[in-house]
């Protein structure tokens, strides 16, 4: 399986909610013996390897807002400690998940990955990660709403395997 | 202050391949925003052919994107479209633009246009 | 795609008189939407970006309102050099798309 970023790019201004997404495409195994673990973090810019660094989403770490379930089911966080930072990761049947962040500030600004890990149980794991990056613009004429932009054609599902 | 400025062939032959040129002053095109192109056939409406990005990430409108390749000469500061596989209705005025000081604000700075006929 | 429609497709008016263009869009492009008028010849000029944000230096008898899918463009007191064609472009979902413009005149 692979994981897709349907937009690269999300400018919101302050103040906006914004959700992330990512996509897992490819065929999924629906086994008795596998576990998704699908869970969002921080990264930095200009790595050898992008999102090989893990930093925390408003003093969340990836562990605090992982998903895990198996195949294509449905999923959401534990809500109290990620809606009292005004965070909520979600997935749904169609292997899209995402993750939610309320009230942005500049300091939401950065880049963000998705990683899925396909556990199996007394068998190897399968890791694949996807980048986007958020800016929040601030100003007094700054657009009301958040714009996306796509990611590439030439990969436009900006596939990246870890 | 921002300008861009179209260049290219104001003729091509049917089938040949369109090449157009937009050389952009004032701002580094790898500093930030989406470098787009936009084509108008006379007498009719605006089409947008695609972008783009600051950090080399391109988009295509997909009624095109099987003919449409944009690239970019950072050294020069410039972007390129090619066109392939032209025919009369690839007739129009193309322009190179970007959006305003901020993202998602329209495309507030357009070159000039350059007027490309496709005829033999 | 989203299909951007305008109307009217021409309209004829007075100076001084208060003019409304609309546009609506086939599904919800939020405010995430723009109006640029051109003059026979010319380049398009940005007017109006995120449905209701006078660009720099644009006049004030230009301002849009809307959001989701119904917008419009109002010019409340028509003046000669006001003679384009205006059309909307949502920049909500890609491809980006525009109108199909409404040619404006002096009667």
């Known amino acids: 399986f692979k994981v897709a970023t349907p937009y690269s790019l999300y400018v919101c201004p302050e103040g906006q909610n914004v959700t992330l997404t990512c996509r897992l495409l490819g065929p999924v195994d629906k086994g008795h013996d596998v576990t998704f673990y699908k869970t969002w973090y921080r990264s930095s810019r200009g790595e050898v390897q992008t999102c090989s660094e893990r930093r925390p989403i408003r003093n969340l770490t990836f562990q605090d807002l992982h998903l895990h379930h198996g195949g294509h089911q449905a999923a959401n966080t534990s809500h109290d400690l990620a809606q009292r930072h005004g965070l909520e990761s979600a997935s749904d049947h169609h292997g899209n998940f995402s993750i939610t962040m309320r009230n942005l500030t500049l300091l939401d600004s950065g880049l963000y990955c998705c990683l899925v890990v396909e556990i199996r149980h007394h068998h190897s794991e399968h890791r694949v990660h996807g980048a986007m990056e958020l800016q929040v613009q601030t100003g007094k004429d700054a657009p009301s709403n958040c714009v996306v932009y796509p990611s590439s054609s030439q990969d436009s599902e900006n596939i990246t395997a870890a | 202050q921002v300008q861009l400025q179209e260049s290219g062939p104001g003729l091509v032959k049917p089938s040949e391949t369109l090449s157009l040129t937009c050389a952009v002053s004032?701002?580094?095109?790898?500093?930030?925003?989406?470098w787009n192109w936009i084509r108008q056939p006379p007498g009719k409406g605006l089409e947008w052919i695609g972008y783009?990005?600051?950090?080399?990430?391109?988009f295509y409108s997909p009624s095109l994107k099987n003919r449409v390749t944009i690239s970019v000469d950072t050294s020069k500061n410039q972007f390129s479209l090619k066109l392939s596989s032209v025919t009369a209705a690839d007739t129009a005025v193309y322009y190179c633009?970007?959006?305003?000081?901020?993202?998602?604000?329209?495309?507030?700075?357009w070159g000039q246009g350059t007027l490309v006929t496709v005829s033999s | 795609d989203i299909q951007m429609t305008q109307s009217p497709s021409s309209l004829s008016a007075s100076v001084g008189d208060r003019v409304t263009i609309t546009c609506k869009a086939s599904q919800n492009v939020n405010t995430n939407l723009a109006w640029y008028q051109q003059k026979p010849g010319k380049v398009p000029k940005l007017l109006i970006y995120?449905?209701?944000y006078r660009y720099s230096g644009v006049p004030s008898r230009f301002s849009g309102s809307g959001s989701g899918t119904d917008f419009t463009l109002t010019i409340s007191s028509l003046q000669p050099e006001d003679v384009a064609t205006y059309y909307c472009q949502q920049y909500n979902n890609y491809p980006l798309t525009f109108g199909q413009g409404t040619k404006l005149e002096i009667k």
């Open positions: 004032g701002y580094s095109i790898t500093s930030g925003y989406f």
């Open positions: 995120s449905a209701s």
């Open positions: 783009m990005g600051y950090d080399g990430r391109i």
């Open positions: 633009a970007r959006e305003g000081d901020y993202y998602g604000s329209g495309f507030a700075y």
